[in-house]
Structures are given as structure tokens and as C-alpha cells.
């Protein structure tokens, strides 16, 4: 494995192979597994791709899918930071319209306090 450490796909890896890339990451990085057909290769990332958040675990940090409804990017399992087009962000969740007492800020698609 060590012979592949200079390979760009092995950046940030603790364990790496030519065929599958990283399988374990350095402490502060997040593991992400790219699947292509029936093959896969791991990467160690400083931040997770859109649609995933950084999940910290005892053995290894990993990127995990954002499962908040209508959310594009999230900070954690239950806190959205960017909603899908057509939805408004309010307190970490996505709504098709802002709750009472909040108005949509069109440029950021966020709900802010104030009159409609």
C-alpha cells in the first residue's frame, strides 16, 4: 500500500491502494466513497460534497448523506444550510413557504423575521 502514497488519490490517506484509493483517513479528514458502476474508490476530504455532511465517529470520520427533506446541503444530520430550489431555509429546515411572521429573502432563499 505504501507504494501508492505519492498518488494524488491517496492524499490524506492512512491506508491507500491503486485500485480502491483511500480506505482510511487522517484524523481530521472525512472519508467519502465514490461508486462508479460496480467499482468504488475512497477519498479523504477536508469538507464533504454537496448533499453530504461531516459525521465524526471514533474509528473514522466520514461524509454522510443529508436526509433533511428538500435540503441540498447540511451542516449536520438535522441542520440544513441550503435548500433545494423553490424551498426556503428556516432554522435548519426547508419549507415551501416561510412560517407566519417571517418573510422570504429571495437572494438567499432564507426566511427572515419581519412582515410579509
Amino acid at each position: 500500500r505504501a507504494s501508492y502514497v505519492s498518488n494524488p488519490i491517496c492524499k490524506g490517506c492512512l491506508s491507500c491502494s491503486k485500485d480502491n484509493g483511500c480506505s482510511r483517513c487522517q484524523q481530521k479528514l472525512f472519508f467519502f466513497l465514490r461508486r462508479e458502476g460496480m467499482r468504488q474508490y475512497g477519498e479523504c476530504l477536508h469538507s464533504c460534497p454537496s448533499g453530504y455532511y461531516g459525521h465524526r465517529a471514533p474509528d473514522m470520520n466520514r461524509c454522510a448523506r443529508c436526509r433533511i427533506e428538500n435540503c441540498d446541503s447540511c451542516f449536520s444530520k438535522d441542520f440544513c444550510t441550503k435548500c433545494k430550489v423553490g424551498f426556503y431555509l428556516h432554522r435548519g429546515r426547508c419549507f415551501d413557504e416561510c412560517p407566519d411572521g417571517f418573510a422570504p429573502l429571495e437572494e438567499t432563499m432564507e426566511c427572515v423575521e419581519g412582515c410579509e
Epitope: S15, S17, N20, S23, R24, F31, F32, L33, R34, R35, G37, M38, R39, Q40, G42, Y52, H55, A57, P58, D59, M60, R62, C63, A64, R65, R67
Partner: antibody, heavy 125, light 107 residues
């Protein structure tokens, strides 16, 4: 509450066919990958097939070309069409949520997080 | 295909004992290992995924650890309802493969 209920098992002769069904409820069926796993009498678990939420299908070599997995999102149902059955296909067949080989989730859906009670398939002459 | 080898194949324990089951993968599977519990005549239940993450509703006495090729499921203080067969599974690359199972019996 997530519920998976299999049906369609039975006794079939070698070379015969059978179609298993799995009725899903308690979750947004169309959003999840689904899998079939079998267990021969007194043996361990063996993965049989998976289908992604988008309809991509995956099989191990042992059933490739003989079994076909499919889904009907409108009916919240998963199916397994089994052709050219052999004695070694005798098992309890479980429907399970998750296990998509085509997508990385980094969470519970990479494993198989909920299972049905199983349906028994016996292949014998 | 990746082989998953569990040990022991069976063990006897008393209520309150600490139980450890190991699973060895034939090649590096990162942390992509799940553990399931199965009782006779019942469907398997997911306990742990990604080596150490407990599934919803799983008691804290169940814990998983490991990465690469060596993985462990630990029951810190086994209860009467924990006597069952346990399977590991790698969810790193297809075909998904399971260990042969470890039966935990009452001493």
C-alpha cells in the same frame, strides 16, 4: 413504522419459476434502495439482489441471468422474478430496505436497516 | 469476492457477562461493516453500521469497532434477550457478503 411483508413463496420443481413480492409501508418507498437476502435452512445469510431508488439493478454471480429484481413505486412494492430454479435456491427469502451498491450514503442505508419476516421457497422434485 | 470470517462460531455466556465477537475481512473494507442480530424463526435486525454507529433504538450495551480488516462487536453486559445469532456484513463492495454467524447461547 417501517413494515415489509413478503409473499409468493412456495414449492416449485427444479427449472421452474416463482415471483416473490414485498409490500412496503411506513416510509417513502421511492426514495430508498431495496434488497433481497436469502437464508438456506440452517445456514447463514446470502445477498441475492439490490435495486436503487432510480431502478439500477445488481446481482451476485450465483443468480445473475436467472433472477430479476424490479420495483413499482406507485404500489410501494418490490419484486423478485426467479427463473431456472435449482435445489440450492431453497431458502427463506427476505426483503430488506437499503443496500444500494451504486450509491454511497455514509449512513444506515449502506447497510440493510429493516427486514421483512421472510417467505419460504422450496425447490424440489 | 470479500470473505468475512467470524469467530467464534458459538459461545456460551451468563447474563451480565461481557461478550466479544470478531469479524475478519479478506481485504480492506474501510469501516464499511454492519452487524445484525437474528433470533430463531425471525428476520435479522440491524444493530451497527459503518463499524461503530448504533442503529435507531439499539441499546447502548451494543458497540462496534474496527477498520481495515478487523472488526469487533461487543455486548458489555449480555441480557436474556441478547441470546441469538450475530452476523457481520461488509457493505464496501459488491457482492455484499456476510460472516457465517456467531451463536450466543445461555451458559
Amino acid at each position: 413504522e417501517v413494515q415489509l411483508v413478503e409473499s409468493g413463496g412456495g414449492l416449485v420443481k427444479p427449472g421452474g419459476s416463482l415471483r416473490l413480492s414485498c409490500a412496503a409501508s411506513g416510509f417513502t418507498f421511492s426514495s430508498y434502495a431495496m434488497s433481497w437476502v436469502r437464508q438456506a435452512p440452517g445456514k447463514g445469510l446470502e445477498w441475492v439482489s439490490s435495486i436503487s431508488s432510480g431502478g439500477s439493478t445488481y446481482y451476485p454471480d450465483s443468480v445473475k441471468g436467472r433472477f430479476t429484481i424490479s420495483r413499482d413505486n406507485a404500489k410501494n412494492s418490490l419484486y423478485l422474478q426467479m427463473n431456472s430454479l435449482r435445489a440450492e435456491d431453497t431458502a427463506v427469502y427476505y426483503c430488506a430496505r437499503g443496500g444500494d451498491p451504486g450509491v454511497y450514503n455514509g449512513d444506515y442505508e449502506d447497510a440493510m436497516d429493516y427486514w421483512g419476516q421472510g417467505t419460504t421457497v422450496t425447490v424440489s422434485s | 469476492d470479500i470473505q468475512m470470517t467470524q469467530s467464534p462460531s458459538s459461545l456460551s455466556a451468563s447474563v451480565g457477562d461481557r461478550v466479544t465477537i470478531t469479524c475478519k475481512a479478506s481485504q480492506d473494507v474501510s469501516s464499511a461493516v454492519a452487524w445484525y442480530q437474528q433470533k430463531p424463526g425471525k428476520a435479522p435486525k440491524l444493530l451497527i453500521y459503518w463499524a461503530s454507529t448504533r442503529h435507531t433504538g439499539v441499546p447502548s450495551r451494543f458497540s462496534g469497532s474496527g477498520s481495515g480488516t478487523d472488526f469487533t462487536l461487543t455486548i458489555s453486559s449480555v441480557q436474556a434477550e441478547d441470546f441469538a445469532t450475530y452476523y457481520c456484513q461488509q457493505h464496501y463492495s459488491t457482492p455484499w457478503t456476510f460472516g457465517q454467524g456467531t451463536k450466543v447461547e445461555i451458559k
